[in-house]
């Protein structure tokens, strides 16, 4: 019964490094926030740099899946 909605303007700073913020709407639980990170970043709030080697690997996998 939960679904994702884009964060309100005032909530966007939950994520850093250009990460896109989403709120998990769930009637039975308090609101939670999730971040969709920009390429090169990871972590709950997009705070961590992804090593270049891993980035290239991800790109290769992405191309392979296409």
């Amino acid at each position: 019964t939960s679904h994702l909605v884009k964060c309100a303007e005032k909530e966007k700073t939950f994520c850093v490094n250009g990460g896109e913020c989403f709120m998990v709407k769930d009637l039975s639980n308090p609101s939670r926030y999730l971040c969709k990170c920009q390429p090169g970043f990871t972590g709950a709030r997009c705070t961590e740099n992804v090593p270049m080697k891993v980035q290239n690997q991800e790109k290769a996998e992405e191309l392979y899946q296409k």
């Epitope: 005032k10 966007k12 700073t13 850093v16 705070t47």
Partner: antibody, heavy 116, light 107 residues
Framework: EVQLVESGGGLVQPGGSLRLSCAAS????????IHWVRQAPGKGLEWVAA????????NYADSVKGRFTISADTSKNTAYLQMNSLRAEDTAVYYC?????????WGQGTLVTVSS | DIQMTQSPSSLSASVGDRVTITCRAS??????VAWYQQKPGKAPKLLIY???FLYSGVPSRFSGSGSGTDFTLTISSLQPEDFATYYC?????????FGQGTKVEIK
């Protein structure tokens, strides 16, 4: 009521070590983001380090990288700042703060003095 | 690192005055800017987050505006308790960085 209480500050010689603690209460510790910010006497605010207890990810200012380590114990609702190889320029009041959409709650601060 | 440059570094004003403090980021930080008030010997207090949103419990005489690189904190009618130092801070990228502060003094 949200509360952050820092402890562990004091006088230490250059090259020495200290461990600061930030005891948190009144909120879900594992769901927050904890930051350490410092303020040298008569100076402005400087961001030092941060930890996301949920996934353990950490970040550091270049000025402390390799010398300071931030950690968190979710069972004790406490964050720590282990400070090694201390220098005179690390002398400051150290604050811990929680971050939701900004640094919304701050502790009272603990003074660290590095001097011989 | 993103530099946050505040101006002025200090100002003198009277009770009832309208006060404006500006903050310029060295690169685009969207609306990821917060403003804090600090009094001597005390921890900073959050006033404004996400550039323009008033934090809970903060008087409505405080307001924030801006996006991209230019931001403003305005106190519409200065009160005796508002004499303090104000800091802007960007949280668009790590490391987070603060402005150097603006001290608001009594004229």
């Amino acid at each position: 009521e949200v509360q952050l209480v820092e402890s562990g500050g004091g006088l230490v010689q250059p090259g020495g070590s200290l461990r600061l603690s930030c005891a948190a209460s009144g909120f879900t510790f594992s769901g927050t983001w904890i930051h350490w910010v410092r303020q040298a006497p008569g100076k402005g605010l400087e961001w030092v380090a941060a930890i996301t207890p949920a996934d353990g990810s950490t970040n550091y200012a270049d000025s402390v990288k390799g010398r300071f380590t931030i950690s968190a114990d979710t069972s004790k609702n406490t964050a720590y700042l282990q400070m090694n190889s201390l220098r005179a320029e690390d002398t400051a009041v150290y604050y811990c703060a929680t971050y939701m959409f900004a640094m919304d709650y701050w502790g009272q601060g603990t003074l660290v003095t590095v001097s011989s | 690192d993103i530099q946050m440059t505040q101006s002025p570094s200090s100002l003198s004003a009277s009770v009832g005055d309208r006060v404006t403090i500006t903050c310029r980021a060295s690169q685009d930080v969207s609306t990821a800017v917060a403003w804090y008030q600090q009094k001597p010997g005390k921890a900073p207090k959050l006033l404004i987050y996400s550039a323009s949103f008033l934090y809970s419990g903060v008087p409505s005489r405080f307001s924030g505006s801006g996006s991209g690189t230019d931001f403003t904190l305005t106190i519409s009618s200065l009160q005796p308790e508002d004499f303090a130092t104000y800091y802007c801070q960007q949280s668009y990228t790590i490391p987070m960085t603060f402005g150097q502060g603006t001290k608001v003094e009594i004229k």
